[in-house]
């Protein structure tokens, strides 16, 4: 299996990729020899081999072409080679070696003549596994891989050299590379290719946010000498209208939206709304659907409710209780309220005018949350029309006509208003004479008055009622020197008015009469 080269390695030289002859310098010329061979994957390659194992004191050098350093500070040399076991070669015991030496020389130009003494030794290279001839039968080549570090390198380039001292070795491939922290995207921040320092220190790199994102915390990472990114700090987040998809911020697709910057995903447009384009921050409401100003973009678009239904009126003289049913269509919102429009009409329903401000609505006229209202202080024997509007948070945004249910009623005759003042005309030991004014609003012809009285100390546990035709009365059979409480109400054809307030009067202790005394409460 071909193992791909790590992405953090940048090749400066790879003999496998060179087309045709490598053309490296071999010194002396009968030492290292360039031949065609195959690598471990049977791919044809150019290799150098030497197998001068008969002679003592071999000193065969092979020098690469000049290798530019680029931005590298520390370089790595990867050698793949095959070393033949000396025991597998007849006649050569004592002269055959199983190591070779690796050298390098830095240089600013590439026309340098080969001189042994200018090279610095990197290491002696030995095989982890040499092979005997037996391995060749079915082409099992024991391929050794050795990697050595060199650095810091400062000049524009360098040469590598291989010194053979009597081994049977083939250089299958020579790869020289440096490590970089490769371009990467972390937390939606892009970090560029970065060449590490040769020393052990980490390089701090500032990231830049990917397209359509912004910094949440300034993104940073550290590039190690091994070409690895370490310790990500900070992050970017996708803008409104974009969501994180892999390493990018991708526009929300039509039909999806994202209202704010951050890590959230694009959401499907809420009901009755849509988007036609990529990257939407909110969704547009369909025709005749609306969203209130303070509604979040996640809220479904709605329309005004339909009219209330089944309005029932319950008239009691000059009051009416109105009840109705919830609209069939709420428009898709829960914030439905009801407004009552009151119109006072003539006998011709078309001739109406707004009701007097004196008319009272319980609990209120506008913004009702329940489906009932009591309207009081209407005029008796008068035609009224009540329009019950159903509204929700988007009603004011819509142009269609109001959604209301109307009911028309006629008030009955109203009972008279209360008697305001009771006056004591005369008292005796066992009688009191009282008089009073007709109510301010008799609301019809007063038929009679109901006079209710009881001893104060008995606290209304037992009381007496009598009727008076006019606006005065004498009450007899009372106890002397006793306080009595009196209440009077008028009656018309419409019924009794409400009682007056309570008035207190005392009978005399003896037989004389006292006249013209007002009451006290």
């Amino acid at each position: 299996e071909l193992s791909p080269q790590p992405s953090n390695e940048v090749n400066l030289l790879d003999s496998k990729t060179i087309q045709g002859e490598l053309g490296w310098i071999s010194y002396p010329s009968h030492g290292w020899e360039e031949i065609s061979g195959v690598d471990e994957h049977y791919t044809p390659i150019r290799t150098y081999q030497v197998c001068n194992v008969m002679d003592h004191s071999q000193n065969n050098w092979l020098r690469t072409n000049w290798v530019p350093r680029n931005s590298a500070q520390k370089i790595y040399v990867e050698l793949k080679f095959t070393l033949r076991d000396c025991n597998s070669i007849p006649l050569v015991l004592g002269t055959c070696k199983e190591t070779f030496n690796l050298y390098y020389m830095e240089s600013d130009d590439h026309g340098v003549k080969f001189r042994e003494h200018q090279f610095t030794k990197i290491d002696t290279i030995a095989a982890d596994e040499s092979f005997t001839q037996m391995d060749l039968g079915d082409r099992i080549l024991k391929l050794n891989t050795e990697i050595r570090e060199v650095g810091p390198v400062n000049k524009k380039g360098f040469y590598l050299a291989f010194q053979d001292v009597g081994a049977c070795v083939a250089l299958v491939s020579v790869r020289v590379y440096f490590k970089k922290c490769p371009f990467t995207v972390k937390n939606l921040a892009m970090f560029p290719d970065t060449v590490p320092m040769d020393s052990q220190s980490l390089v701090e790199v500032r990231g830049s946010c990917v397209n359509n994102s912004k910094e949440e915390d300034p993104p940073r990472m550290y590039c190690s000498t091994e070409g690895e990114w370490l310790v990500p700090i900070g992050k970017c987040t996708c803008n409104a209208g974009y969501e994180e998809r892999g390493f990018i911020c991708q526009a929300c697709r039509p039909g999806f939206y994202k209202a704010s910057d951050g890590a959230a995903k694009c959401a499907k447009c809420p009901p009755h709304s849509s988007t036609q384009e990529d990257g939407s921050m909110n969704c547009r409401c369909e025709n005749n659907y609306f969203r209130a100003e303070k509604d979040p973009p996640s809220m479904a678009c709605a329309r005004p409710p339909s009219a209330p239904r089944n309005v029932i009126s319950n008239i009691n003289e000059t009051s009416v209780i109105l009840d109705w049913s919830w609209p069939l269509d709420t428009g898709g919102r829960k914030d439905i309220t009801f407004n009552i429009i009151c119109k006072k009409c003539g006998w011709n329903v078309r001739q109406c005018e707004p009701c007097s401000p004196n008319v009272r609505f319980l609990p209120r006229q506008l913004g009702l949350t329940n489906t009932t209202v009591t309207v009081t202080d209407l005029l008796a024997h008068t035609n009224y029309t009540f329009e019950i509007d159903a509204v929700n948070g988007v009603s004011e945004l819509s142009s269609p006509p109001r959604q209301y249910a109307a009911v028309s009623i006629t008030t009955n005759q109203a009972a008279p208003s209360p008697v305001m003042t009771i006056k004591k005309d005369r008292t005796s030991r066992n009688s009191i004479s009282l008089s009073w004014q007709e109510p301010e609003h008799p609301n019809g012809i007063i038929l009679d008055y109901e006079v209710k009285y009881y001893q104060k100390q008995e606290q209304e546990t037992s009381y007496t009622i009598l009727r008076a035709r006019g606006t005065n009365v004498t009450i007899s059979s009372l106890k002397p020197d006793t306080t009595y409480v009196f209440q009077i109400r008028a009656r018309t054809a419409a019924g009794y008015g409400t009682n007056s307030r309570k008035f207190e009067f005392e009978t005399s202790p003896d037989s004389f009469s006292i006249s013209g005394e007002n009451s006290h409460v």
Epitope: H30, N52, V53, M54, P90, Q133, L136, G137, C168, A170
Partner: antibody
């Protein structure tokens, strides 16, 4: 250029001896072993053995021990094959061939032109 | 001693055709054989060694393959100069040759 130069044909009587030279040029003589190969008339190749040109240490193939001797004179880059007590069945072309050891395998990469030795009474 | 048997003894081919020569070892050998070409009146010439490495100057129409006991030399398109005798040779502590295959013009 690399070459191995052998002497011309030899005619010998049975029981006599012959010494066939093989002079190397164009490379360091002591850096490569030398092999000897026999080819009887109309027959195939027979490997006789080889000699380490560095140490002078010979190795003989089966059937080529006793009467056959490999030797060297490194001062003149020459290898020798000496056959004593010649027999009629020794009549053949004798080749010297330079041995090539490589990482991937061995072979004889440079051959002399051959010396015909005829044994006849 | 390992015996190498080559077949066929003679192979008749026309120029431009493919030629396949076989070399069988009497027992499994430790390494692929070397192959040699010999023309009449000339010394043998090394073609291939180390399983599949062509010797210097050998054209790429010559290739070798095989393992264990069965080995093959293939000439992909025979040229007029390729008519000759071909030998396989096993190497190790002791070397042996096959008896040869003659490639002749059909």
């Amino acid at each position: 250029q690399v070459q191995l130069l052998q002497s011309g044909a030899e005619v010998k009587k049975p029981g006599a001896s012959v010494k066939v030279p093989c002079k190397a040029s164009g490379y360091t003589f002591t850096s490569r072993a030398m092999s000897w190969v026999r080819q009887a008339p109309g027959q195939g190749l027979e490997w006789m053995g080889w000699i380490n040109t560095n140490t002078g240490n010979p190795t003989y193939a089966q059937g080529f021990t006793g009467r056959f001797v490999f030797s060297l004179d490194t001062s003149v880059s020459t290898a020798y094959l000496q056959i004593s007590s010649l027999k009629a069945e020794d009549t053949a072309v004798y080749y010297c061939a330079r041995v090539r050891f490589t990482v991937y395998g061995d072979g004889m990469d440079v051959w002399g032109q051959g010396t015909l030795v005829t044994v006849s009474s | 001693e390992i015996v190498l048997t080559q077949s066929p003894a003679t192979l008749s081919v026309s120029p431009g055709e493919r030629a396949t020569l076989s070399c069988r070892a009497s027992q499994s050998v430790s390494s692929n054989p070397a192959w040699y070409q010999q023309k009449p009146g000339q010394a043998p010439r090394l073609l291939i060694y180390g399983a599949s490495t062509r010797a210097t100057g050998i054209p790429d129409r010559f290739s070798a393959s095989g393992s264990g006991t069965d080995f093959t030399l293939t000439i992909s398109r025979v040229e007029p100069e390729d008519f000759a005798v071909y030998y396989c040779q096993q190497y190790g502590p002791s070397w042996t040759f096959g008896q040869g295959t003659k490639v002749e013009i059909k």
